[in-house]
């Protein structure tokens, strides 16, 4: 897991609550599932469902649960020590180069050109000239061929946040 | 007065590794979180590992996640960060810190040493 | 992660004059903010945590305010000594800092 998680919003701020678990710090860290106390001499329960820490860390709140967007589905539930993970539904991906949203695979190959790889969540159908075995820049053509794709086989997760 | 001096730094290529210390005193040393921050050359500051008083748990942001390690001998006094798979962006001034008492944060830093990471 | 957005980049003032650098959060930090003061070549300094209390020796002219996403750090009654580059810090996730704001003799 990585400490800096990008793009995820802090918690609100607040206050532990008493169901909040409280324990002390080791050697003046907090470990997973939790946050420290503004005077560093507990560590607090992230809630769950709501926010989360996947490290020893000294963070002040816990991060914010990532929400999965719609054309999206949720692989895992947000947990105390783990964020969501999200995946595009079948029929879509996400390219690491644009991560914020999820796009439509293209249904066919151009002209010329034939299918080696299958639409997945995480990268379009992948198409190779019949003759060199060239893959294809991925731009949609203005003349597809009836060559389709079946729809994408769920694997790992192109989003993992966490 | 608390003191820390970095040293190790100097001229290495892209790929290659390095090892930093940071020699600490005027402090019970073994009590403080502690940490690495670094600056490019005319660039703003930034975090780059964290380790706890007892050295048992580290964390690191991406950028270095994987290539450094942040390690420290309490009966010595010192903490260290070795660095592996080098990077011209790596290029920083590199200070040792250590966590205030009760503030969650930088009280002390040392002066830096320079680290250049150049074929 | 929570970028500061550290203004001005660079100012020019004499001393006496009354110094403001403003820094903006991305997202509320609460008053996890802190205020260091370097010069070149040298270690930097604490000068401020918890948006507005002084470190340990820290002249009363330096005065630190704001919560939530927007922090200031005033000098009062600029002196000799003080003219060096400034940075903002948030510590509620991670660490991260202010680009500068370099305070110069106009």
């Known amino acids: 897991e990585s400490a800096l998680i990008t793009q995820q919003d802090l918690a609100p701020q607040q206050r532990a609550a008493p169901q909040q678990k409280r324990s002390s710090p080791s050697e003046g860290l907090c470990p997973p599932g939790h946050h420290i106390s503004e005077d560093g001499r507990d560590c607090i329960s992230c809630k769950y469902g709501q926010d989360y820490s996947t490290h020893w860390n000294d963070l002040l709140f816990c991060l914010r649960c990532t929400r999965c967007d719609s054309g999206e589905v949720e692989l895992s539930p947000c947990t105390t020590t783990r964020n969501t993970v999200c995946q595009c539904e079948e029929g879509t991906f996400r390219e690491e180069d644009s991560p914020e949203m999820c796009r439509k695979c293209r249904t066919g190959c151009p002209r010329g050109m034939v299918k080696v790889g299958d639409c997945t969540p995480w990268s379009d159908i992948e198409c190779v000239h019949k003759e060199s075995g060239t893959k294809h820049s991925g731009e949609v053509p203005a003349v597809e061929e009836t060559v389709t794709s079946s729809p994408g086989t769920p694997a790992s997760p192109c989003s993992l946040s966490g | 007065e608390v003191m820390l001096v970095e040293s190790g730094g100097g001229l290495v290529q892209p790929g290659g590794s390095l090892r930093l210390s940071c020699a600490a005193s005027?402090?019970?040393?073994?009590?403080?979180?502690m940490s690495w921050v670094r600056q490019a050359p005319g660039k703003g500051l930034e975090w780059v590992a964290t380790?706890?008083?007892?050295?048992?748990?580290?964390y690191y942001p991406d950028s270095v996640k994987g290539r450094f390690t942040i390690s420290r001998d309490n009966a010595k006094n010192t903490l260290y960060l070795q660095m592996s798979s080098l990077r011209a962006e790596d290029t920083a001034v590199y200070y040792c810190?250590?966590?205030?008492?009760?503030?969650?944060?930088?009280?002390?830093w040392g002066q830096g040493t320079l680290v250049t990471v150049s074929s | 992660d929570i970028v500061m957005t550290q203004s001005p980049s660079s100012l020019s003032a004499s001393v006496g004059d009354r110094v403001t650098i403003t820094c903006k959060a991305s997202?509320?930090?609460?008053?996890?903010v802190a205020w260091y003061q370097q010069k070149p070549g040298k270690a930097p300094k604490l000068l401020i945590y918890?948006?507005?209390t002084r470190h340990t020796g820290v002249p009363d002219r330096f005065t630190g305010s704001g919560s939530g996403t927007d922090f200031t750090l005033t000098i009062s009654s600029l002196q000799p000594e003080d003219f060096a580059t400034y940075y903002c810090?948030?510590?509620?996730?991670?660490?991260?800092f202010g680009q500068g704001t370099k305070v110069e003799i106009k």
């Open positions: 810090q948030q510590y509620s996730s991670y660490r991260t």
């Open positions: 005027g402090f019970t040393f073994s009590s403080y979180v």
């Open positions: 810190a250590r966590r205030g008492d009760s503030m969650i944060t930088t009280d002390y």
């Open positions: 918890w948006a507005s």
């Open positions: 380790i706890s008083s007892g050295g048992s748990y580290t």
């Open positions: 997202q509320d930090v609460g008053t996890a």
